[in-house]
Amino acid sequence: QQQTLPKPFIWAEPHFMVPKEKQVTICCQGNYGAVEYQLHFEGSLFAVDRPKPPERINKVKFYIPDMNSRMAGQYSCIYRVGELWSEPSNLLDLVVTEMYDTPTLSVHPGPEVISGEKVTFYCRLDTATSMFLLLKEGRSSHVQRGYGKVQAEFPLGPVTTAHRGTYRCFGSYNNHAWSFPSEPVKLLVTGDIENTSLAPEDPTFPADTWGTYLLTTETGLQKDHALWDHTAQNLLR
């Protein structure tokens, strides 16, 4: 007698960060033969899907056509085989962006620095928010939190070439409602490659990491399909 079913995977396409009024699809992947999938939002049943035919489908999609702050929050999904339900998936934090205002991102001493220099990013937003988020675009979009009345500091410490890349920041009105993104700031780090080749990727962002998403400036926020399992630490919890 089967007593447990593996928990399903949950993710958002194209991304967990969704501009307001844009569409997003929440995907839930369980097992072939699953009779029913349930999507739960903030602990309550949000939607149900029954794949047809169950034996040929192991993934369902829940479409949100018009993202807004009421739809932002924590989602999880479960599925059943017969009358046996799986464990719930990990929580997916769906964030609505492009709310209210646009912060300004600046970097000190400047966007071109030498390896070993101390670098600090400043994210400023004059409206009522006290939490700021700094994201580095790339294979794993690292997120760092900062706090301040109208401005947050993000000290990177002595930088290496691993810090090279494009950064954006957001103001956060609550855990799941973020501002428009700032204009991107490209950090260029020059220095001795030998000394930095063994440095871990983005060493200043060890605590808050989503190792799952690819951010691109042209198309907005894209999911990295090679790393789709939403397993990394969750900034919002």
Partner: antibody, heavy 117, light 107 residues
């Protein structure tokens, strides 16, 4: 072995409430859903609803939704079904049933609830 | 709600007879169907799950078949202990619903 032991027969007046218990043993209580099914005298089977004891999530037959509450106590591996605003047509045997990957695989012995003025 | 229509509602048969009970769902239930046997004063007992799979300890003279909306329970050679009422039930959606039952009586 899996056992579902239900509370004893009840006689209730119309308008009253009844709470039937179902103590599970022989398996991990939180790994399986618990359903409730009733059977009026000489009639067929009618599904009332279920609870996932792990999460407390419940789902009900719309017919009973306003009058039924299904709960579970993980510490005692016991499920409960409470039916309120009883009427004579609620006279039935009420069964708790374990839900597994095979469907309704183990049933309690049944509890007769008689509603009579 | 999905309606389950079971037929016949009763039948008379002799020991050794082949007995067939059918169940029709009001929509495709994708083989999410179970069959139960119930004897007077007792709780139902699972015979078949997922339309065709025999539950543990159920004699091989019982078999289930069907797909889509139409399903059948067959008893290949009726035994004295098989005289009972049989129910089909779907577990495709909510609410789960049962057929009206088929009473198998001794001829």
């Amino acid at each position: 072995q899996v056992q579902l032991v239900q509370s004893g027969a009840e006689v209730k007046k119309p308008g009253a409430s009844v709470k039937v218990s179902c103590k599970a043993s022989g398996y991990t209580f939180t790994s399986f859903t618990m359903h409730w099914v009733r059977q009026a005298p000489g009639q067929g089977l009618e599904w009332i609803g279920y609870i996932n004891p792990s999460s407390g999530y419940t789902e009900y037959n719309q017919k009973f939704k306003d009058r039924t509450t299904i709960t579970a106590d993980k510490s005692t591996s016991t499920a409960y079904m409470e039916l309120s605003s009883l009427r004579s047509e609620d006279t039935a045997v009420y069964y708790c049933v374990r839900g597994s990957s095979r469907g309704f695989d183990y049933w309690g012995q049944g509890t007769l609830v008689t509603v009579s003025s | 709600d999905i309606q389950m229509t079971q037929s016949p509602s009763s039948l008379s048969a002799s020991v050794g007879d082949r007995v067939t009970i059918t169940c029709r769902a009001s929509e495709n239930i994708y083989s999410n169907l179970a069959w139960f046997q119930q004897k007077p004063g007792k709780a139902p007992k699972l015979l078949v799950y997922a339309a065709t799979n025999l539950a543990d300890g159920v004699p091989s003279r019982f078999s289930g078949s069907g797909s889509g909306t139409d399903y059948t329970l067959t008893i290949s050679s009726l035994q004295p202990e098989d005289f009972a009422t049989y129910y089909c039930q779907h577990f495709w959606g909510t609410p789960r619903t049962f057929g009206g039952g088929t009473k198998v009586e001794i001829k």
